[in-house]
Interface confidence: low
């Protein structure tokens, strides 16, 4: 089951909103044309590990440090950017890091939002992908984020790794995988309604930066945290809806939903379970992808400490991380107990799924995601999981 989780916070909500799992992708284009517009389809799309949270949560949980475009090392434009490793060591980013399947286009956005069109069915691994024997495939996967997915995806992107869920396991043709790196979390009318209350969220703006956080929940895309049920079902993994960096949005809620602890992965660590339960990633030689996490949006404060990222220029920030002399922490750093700390150092697990955190000058935190033969990760914080497995019901 392609257990791909939505990459950015908004991604989840809009991933596979509405295409029947059995239909082939309407368009196998692998360009990242932009977030799909939500649709009111009732198709049962879920991603393994998808949860039922909303995009808002996704943003919150993923501590969605969203804002300006985020970069992927494998996309042109990164060149030999110098990055600071989490430890402070400078590392040169490779000019080009091949994407695992070369299915992703450039991620420098925000791109124009394409009109929503009927999306296609679950994507399959691209040619060259190795498929594990069907016997190793799970019959079902976690649905963690399934309910927070957005509407139908645009042709250029196809469903976000949703996949039919029940029945026998059959590898799909390796030509349908549609790799989408972000979702705008648009509602059925193409507006970012689900992100409306997120700090610095685009609201009803039609041009949103890439964002997505926890079961935000789409919750199913919310994809990132945990849910995936269905009939012609598909689920697709999502990232945590609750990343613990923004608790303010939940202040209305009972403390039951409050995110505790200062680590990005806490009780709401909806990381994007995908693939067969208990099945680890492939054993192939790991490769990786880079994702710059634009530290332009303010992050809510972390319980127990005052941590915040500065908002984009011109945007009001709720928790501007300003230093004693009134200056802000630079990109990729957050104010913590009076000093500016690298998010990479402050949050050891900032990059999910074993990704490596780096700081890129003027860009901010950057995650280098792991990739192996049968499973790889992507998303701003490697919160999305993609596998070569696809279960057909």
């Amino acid at each position: 089951v392609p257990a791909r989780e939505a990459g950015s916070a908004v991604e989840a909500e809009e991933l596979v909103k509405g295409s029947p799992a059995w239909e082939p992708p309407a368009n196998d284009t692998r360009e990242e044309a932009g977030p799909p517009a939500a649709g009111e389809d009732e198709a049962s799309w879920t991603a393994p590990g998808g949860e039922l949270a909303g995009p808002e949560e996704v943003l919150q949980e993923s501590a969605a440090v969203t804002g300006t475009a985020w970069l992927e090392a494998d996309s042109p434009g990164l060149g030999g950017v110098t990055a600071e490793a989490g430890s402070g060591d400078a590392q040169a980013l490779p000019a080009t890091l091949q994407a695992p399947h070369e299915v992703l286009g450039q991620s420098i956005m925000p791109p124009a939002i394409p009109e929503a069109t009927e999306a296609s069915g679950p994507p399959s691994p691209t040619p060259g992908d190795k498929l594990s024997p069907a016997s190793e495939l799970p019959k079902e996967s976690p649905l963690e984020v399934w309910l927070n997915l957005g509407g139908s995806t645009p042709d250029p992107q196809g469903p976000e790794l949703t996949y039919p869920f029940q029945g026998t396991l059959e590898p799909q043709p390796a030509s349908d995988i549609i790799d989408i790196d972000y979702f705008e979390g648009l509602d059925g009318e193409g507006r970012g309604a689900d992100l409306g209350s997120f700090p610095g969220s685009p609201g009803t703006s039609e041009n949103h930066p890439d964002t997505e956080g926890e079961t935000p929940s789409w919750s199913l895309l919310d994809l990132y945290d945990d849910f995936t049920p269905f009939d012609e079902s598909d689920f697709y993994p999502t990232t945590s809806f609750y990343d613990d960096l923004d608790e303010e949005e939940e202040e209305e809620e009972d403390d039951k939903d409050a995110v505790g602890g200062g680590d990005l992965e806490d009780e709401n660590e909806l990381l994007v379970p995908t693939g067969k339960p208990g099945l680890g990633p492939g054993t192939g030689q790991p490769t990786s992808r880079w994702h710059a996490v634009p530290p332009q949006h303010t992050l809510g404060s972390v319980p127990g400490s005052s941590i915040a990222l500065r908002p984009r220029p011109g945007e009001p920030g709720r928790d501007l991380a300003s230093s004693e002399n009134g200056t802000e922490c630079r990109s990729g750093f957050v104010r913590h107990n009076g000093s500016c700390r690298s998010v990479c150092d402050l949050f050891p697990s900032y990059c999910h799924n074993g990704g490596q955190c780096y700081l890129v000058e003027n860009i901010g935190a950057f995650c280098r995601c792991n990739t192996q033969d049968y499973i790889w990760h992507k998303g701003m914080r490697c919160e999305s999981i993609i596998t070569d497995f696809q279960v057909m019901c």
Partner: antibody, heavy 118, light 113 residues
Framework: EVQLLESGGGLVQPGGSLRLSCAAS????????MSWVRQAPGKGLEWVSA????????YYADSVKGRFTISRDNSKNTLYLQMNSLRAEDTAVYYC???????????WGQGTLVTVSS | DIVMTQSPDSLAVSLGERATINCKSS????????????LAWYQQKPGQPPKLLIY???TRESGVPDRFSGSGSGTDFTLTISSLQAEDVAVYYC?????????FGQGTKVEIK
């Protein structure tokens, strides 16, 4: 305080229709997926349907697919369950539940009883 | 669908004693990608809606007394009430939250001996 209040239950004949509502308060409704879970008298729990925070994605148990429709109005913080072609086996207390990202139901309404009988 | 089977169907325990409920899933609900078991436990008292006690097999929901604990991984899980209190009399359900449809165990009724 998170509160969920279901309404719309009642007695209906087989083949009839009913629309349940769930008014939510105390949390950012549009940020959470919501579900309907039912419990037949003296029986266990059965997940019925779920909907994403935006309402763009919906999910159903096979037993109700094609007959029930889940929807939500985020402007009214209200969740709905339109039930058509009701059968005797649909008789149950229907609960709306706030759904965590990991798909666990952390808040439940008090439930509304739906009785399908001739 | 993943079938959840609880045992025993009913349990009578003396106040202050330990109560143990088992839950078995027909297939693993453990996801190696995040090492999480997608299993939740609920408590339902007569005339009331269920209440979430545990999720991810062992994480207690906020406000749940620490006498309730969850354990297990893969397909076998256990809910333990370390010292049964009168207010713990209820029916307990396990639920897998890994795949759709979400499914519950048939329930275990806990009473005071």
């Amino acid at each position: 305080e998170v509160q969920l209040l279901e309404s719309g239950g009642g007695l209906v004949q087989p083949g009839g229709s009913l629309r349940l509502s769930c008014a939510a308060s105390g949390f950012t409704f549009s940020s959470y997926a919501m579900s309907w879970v039912r419990q037949a008298p003296g029986k266990g729990l059965e997940w019925v349907s779920a909907i994403s925070g935006s309402g763009g994605s919906t999910y159903y148990a096979d037993s109700v697919k094609g007959r029930f429709t889940i929807s939500r109005d985020n402007s009214k913080n209200t969740l709905y369950l339109q039930m058509n072609s009701l059968r005797a086996e649909d008789t149950a207390v229907y609960y709306c539940a706030k759904t965590k990202p990991n798909n666990a139901f952390d808040y439940w309404g008090q439930g509304t009883l739906v009785t399908v009988s001739s | 669908d993943i079938v959840m089977t609880q045992s025993p169907d009913s349990l009578a325990v003396s106040l202050g004693e330990r109560a143990t409920i088992n839950c078995k899933s027909s297939q693993s609900v453990l996801y190696s990608s995040n090492n999480k078991n997608y299993l939740a436990w609920y408590q339902q008292k007569p005339g009331q809606p269920p209440k979430l006690l545990i999720y991810w097999a062992s994480t207690r929901e906020s406000g749940v007394p620490d006498r309730f604990s969850g354990s297990g991984s893969g397909t076998d899980f256990t809910l333990t009430i370390s010292s049964l209190q009168a207010e713990d009399v209820a029916v307990y359900y396990c639920q897998q939250t890994a795949t759709q449809p979400l499914t519950f165990g048939q329930g275990t009724k806990v009473e005071i001996k």
